[in-house]
């Protein structure tokens, strides 16, 4: 007889997601020689303690915090580049700008980037089926109360100029609901961080409005100035042509008005 | 706060020099790329010249040859020395910085701004 199973109403589990995090794991620490200490087989065993067995309503940072030590990583503090609604651009940029780091270039962020998973309580599965929306189901649930905790803590080490890239293309540029606006912008240390520098990336070809002064990006200065963090914002009117000056400086395309 | 600070115009006649001064405060001077731009009267602001924290270069085709900009990280300080002046060199000049790249102003704000200093040259 096929057991009862809960019908959650987001995707399931990632297929092959074991494997996923685990063949992620060991790509990540042959890239990065300061995480080849990292046992990969212990990583996987600590995700998966986070949520298996467990109810996928009912997840807690505190599930997590076996894999947030496994994964501890040093990234230079001045360097951290937040973004909102924006993902691609914001890898795209630090690809080119090597010494800038999203939480996607961290060990834990690359493990889980792109993916969902959940379990079921008191079995030892994996739901491949469906797993709990954030709105529809619940938001403690495996995929939000991880990115949650990683995002927390990579907010809490950043230090001096710290900066986020934010989606001009849409209706709320800053979004007090996004995980920028709900977690990373009230986990920045005052005592450490002296600004928080947005860019501001236009969609329109010829958009050249100054989206600094949008309500959101007001509103964003507004929360952050309580914080006693400097503000201060830029737009980037062009972002295709802005990355590739950013490769290429002395490109003339980047500087000629002709 | 972050503070960038021009100086250093003033009137000269044509084929005559100047040099400007931009003094910044508030940030990691050395890490960022600082330039220049002008604004002619009823004009966009253009750029000019930029300088990367690397040290490297870039100049606006109108005056290659006659201006060099340079910088001095131990003073927190920009330069830009302006050589056989023009007078379709007058114009209002402002520095400015980012942590990234200096663009002209279709691709992307500098990331700060400073006030500008007058440059008026005459014939």
């Known amino acids: 007889v096929p057991r009862w199973r809960q019908q959650w109403s987001g995707p399931g589990t990632t297929k092959r997601f074991p494997e996923t995090v685990l063949a992620r794991c060991v790509k990540y620490t042959e890239i990065h020689p300061e995480m080849r200490h990292v046992d990969c087989q212990s990583v996987w065993d600590a995700f998966k303690g986070a949520f298996i067995s467990k109810h996928p309503c009912n997840i807690t940072e505190e599930d997590y915090q076996p894999l947030m030590k496994l994964g501890t990583q040093t990234v230079p503090c001045n360097k951290i580049l937040l973004w909102s609604r924006i993902k691609d651009l914001a890898h795209q940029f630090t690809q080119v700008q090597r010494d800038m780091f999203t939480l996607e270039d961290t060990l834990l962020g690359y493990l889980a980037d792109d993916l969902t998973w959940c379990g079921e309580f008191n079995t030892s599965k994996i739901n491949y089926q469906s797993c709990p929306d954030w709105r529809k189901d619940c938001s403690n649930n495996p995929v939000s109360v991880f990115w949650k905790t990683v995002s927390r803590r990579f907010a809490e080490a950043a230090c001096d100029v710290v900066h986020v890239m934010l989606n001009g293309s849409r209706s709320k540029i800053f979004d007090k609901n996004s995980t920028f606006g709900s977690v990373e912008v009230h986990n920045l240390q005052p005592e450490k961080v002296q600004t928080l520098e947005a860019w501001v990336i236009h969609g329109g070809r010829e958009d050249s409005r100054d989206l600094c002064q949008d309500p959101t990006i007001k509103e964003l200065e507004s929360i952050i100035s309580k914080r006693n963090i400097q503000f201060s914002c830029k737009n980037i009117y062009r972002p295709d042509k802005f990355l590739q000056c950013v490769k290429n400086p002395e490109d003339s395309s980047c500087t000629s008005e002709i | 706060d972050v503070q960038l600070q021009a100086s250093g115009g003033g009137s000269v006649q044509a084929g005559g020099s100047l040099r400007l001064s931009c003094a910044a405060s508030g940030l990691s001077f050395s890490d960022y790329a600082m330039g220049w731009f002008r604004q002619e009267p009823g004009k966009e602001r253009r750029f000019v010249a930029s300088i990367r924290s690397s040290g490297g270069t870039t100049y606006a085709e109108s005056v290659k040859g006659r201006f060099t900009i340079s910088r001095d990280n131990a003073k927190n300080t920009m330069y830009l020395q302006m050589n056989n002046l023009k007078p379709e060199d007058t114009a209002v000049y402002y520095c400015?910085?980012?942590?990234?790249?200096?663009?002209?102003?279709?691709?992307?704000?500098?990331?700060?701004w400073g006030q500008g200093t007058q440059v008026t040259v005459s014939s």
């Open positions: 400015a910085a980012d942590r990234l790249v200096i663009t002209k102003l279709s691709i992307a704000d500098p990331g700060y």
